[in-house]
């Protein structure tokens, strides 16, 4: 009896220009001869229903139909047929087949790839044409995949230490889309220094797909307007 | 930085058993196999078998088949040697190394080494 | 098993002097038009280090005074100009098959 699992769930997350491996491991009932089997990788694009081979293993040769893709000889003697492919891509997203060929015996799995790529964060204080005592914080999120995003602003203060979300005063833009299929967008924070506590601390969270925890970019409202350092203007606080 | 820190010296009778640890950092352990060998007092090496921590699959050399097994502990990252039914020839320094899979067979980083006396 | 044959099996070499290991397998390391040869040293009191794998690869870090060839079943480790530091025993290990095995070693002193 011969047997292939994939992925447990049926789905395998990986980060933009990371080595992914793709899990396929074979099941037999005797130890495997790697000389008198096969191994063939296909891949189905999220756009064409057309499936085309990306790798395939047969005795004493291998080609790879997609650069750099590999499975392991080494780790096919114990069972192990799981596809290498270094610094993937986000149009490399779709649904991988991995067939496997002891003859007579044909045994295949299938498992859906999701290329993701995590957001940087950064906060900066624009101050051009506001108001007396008014500042504009602006969070950019940028480079990330898929995108879905949500940002929310929170705020600290010594009376209130848990964090409060703000809904007022923020204006999230559009999400622009970047040459490299990644994505952008700005939320900005409008405040009213004045009838503002010092102290209290301000937070951009942006929560996506590709981040176990919530990003968050922090500043403190001190007692002097404007008093941002420069690093706080311009830096990652995440 | 990669490294592979081994469990300490271990002292034996003949009969029981030994199992040796590797701790491994500084890569994505399932990304490469980890190999056993061992050396015994002013000899060569010896390659004992290895294991993929991915699918716990293990090849073993059929010289210890029956006495050796290796596992691994991925929420940890350390993989295991343990040989048992110890004779006085197995007195060695057991290794492990970082065993290169996809691109060519290689042992590229080594841990320090477990020395193991097996003495009545 | 595959039966890798280094000879000599020890050297002595006056520093900045050249090299030369020779290991001979019992049949051939080549599969899919690469060698499955490897080369290691280890130095007094240390465990092994890689050197060279697939014949001719030289490792991340090593000196390129250390070069390997050959394919199918004659392999050899140069060192160019050999340093105090190099002394030690050289292993050739082929991972072609299993088991994985080692050469004897050749034990490289400085005269």
């Known amino acids: 009896d011969l047997k292939v699992e994939m992925m447990a769930g049926g789905t395998q997350i990986t980060p933009l220009n990371d080595n992914v491996t793709i899990f396929c491991n074979i099941f037999y009932s005797q130890p495997l001869n790697i000389t008198s089997m096969g191994i063939t990788w296909f891949w189905k694009s999220l756009t064409f229903d057309k499936e085309v081979k990306v790798f395939e293993f047969f005795g004493d040769h291998q080609e790879a139909f997609r650069p750099g893709a590999i499975v392991s000889p080494w780790r096919l003697k114990s069972g192990d047929a799981s596809l290498r492919l270094p610094g993937i891509q986000l149009e490399e997203a779709g649904e991988y087949r991995c067939e496997v060929v002891v003859t007579p015996l044909k045994a295949q799995g299938t498992v859906q790839l999701e290329v993701v790529a995590s957001p940087a964060s950064r906060l900066l204080l624009d101050q051009v044409g506001m108001k007396e005592n008014e500042d504009k914080y602006m969070c950019e999120s940028s480079g990330f995949y898929p995108e879905a995003i949500n940002i929310t602003w929170e705020k600290q203060t010594q009376k209130f230490p848990h964090p409060i979300e703000i809904s007022e005063d923020v204006i999230t833009g559009p999400t622009i889309k970047n040459m490299d299929g990644t994505f952008n967008v700005t939320s900005c924070l409008k405040l009213n220094s004045s009838q503002e506590d010092p102290g209290t601390v301000y937070q951009c969270v942006v929560r996506h797909a590709s981040l176990h925890t919530p990003l968050r970019s922090n500043f403190t409202l001190t007692a002097a307007r404007h008093s941002l350092s420069e690093t706080e203007k311009t830096d990652n606080f995440s | 930085e990669v490294q592979l820190v081994q469990s300490g010296a271990e002292v034996k009778k003949p009969g029981a058993s030994v199992k040796v640890s590797c701790k491994a950092s500084?890569?994505?352990?399932?990304?490469?196999?980890m190999d056993w060998v061992r050396q015994a007092p002013g000899q060569g090496l010896e390659w004992m078998g290895d294991?993929?921590?991915?699918?716990?699959?293990?090849l073993y050399n059929q010289k210890f088949r029956g006495r050796v097994t290796m596992t691994v502990d991925t929420s940890i990252s350390t993989a295991y040697m343990e040989l048992s039914r110890l004779r006085s020839d197995d007195t060695a320094v057991y290794y492990c190394?970082?065993?290169?899979?996809?691109?060519?067979?290689?042992?590229?980083?080594w841990g320090q080494g477990t020395t193991v006396t097996v003495s009545s | 098993d595959i039966v890798l044959t280094q000879t000599p099996l020890s050297l002595s070499v006056t520093p900045g002097q050249p090299a030369s290991i020779s290991c001979k397998a019992s049949?051939?390391?080549?599969?899919?038009?690469?060698?499955?040869m490897n080369w290691y040293l280890q130095k007094p009191g240390q465990p092994p280090q890689l050197l060279i794998y697939a014949a001719s690869t030289l490792h991340s870090g090593i000196p390129d005074r250390f070069s390997g060839s050959g394919s199918g079943t004659d392999f050899t480790l140069k060192i160019s100009r050999v340093e105090a530091e190099d002394v030690g025993v050289y292993y050739c290990q082929q991972s072609k098959e299993d088991p994985r095995t080692f050469g004897q070693g050749t034990k490289l002193e400085i005269k």
């Open positions: 190394a970082r065993s290169e899979v996809f691109y060519g067979n290689y042992a590229d980083y």
């Open positions: 294991i993929n921590p991915n699918n716990g699959g293990t």
């Open positions: 049949q051939s390391v080549d599969y899919d038009g690469d060698s499955y």
């Open positions: 500084g890569y994505t352990f399932t990304d490469y196999n």
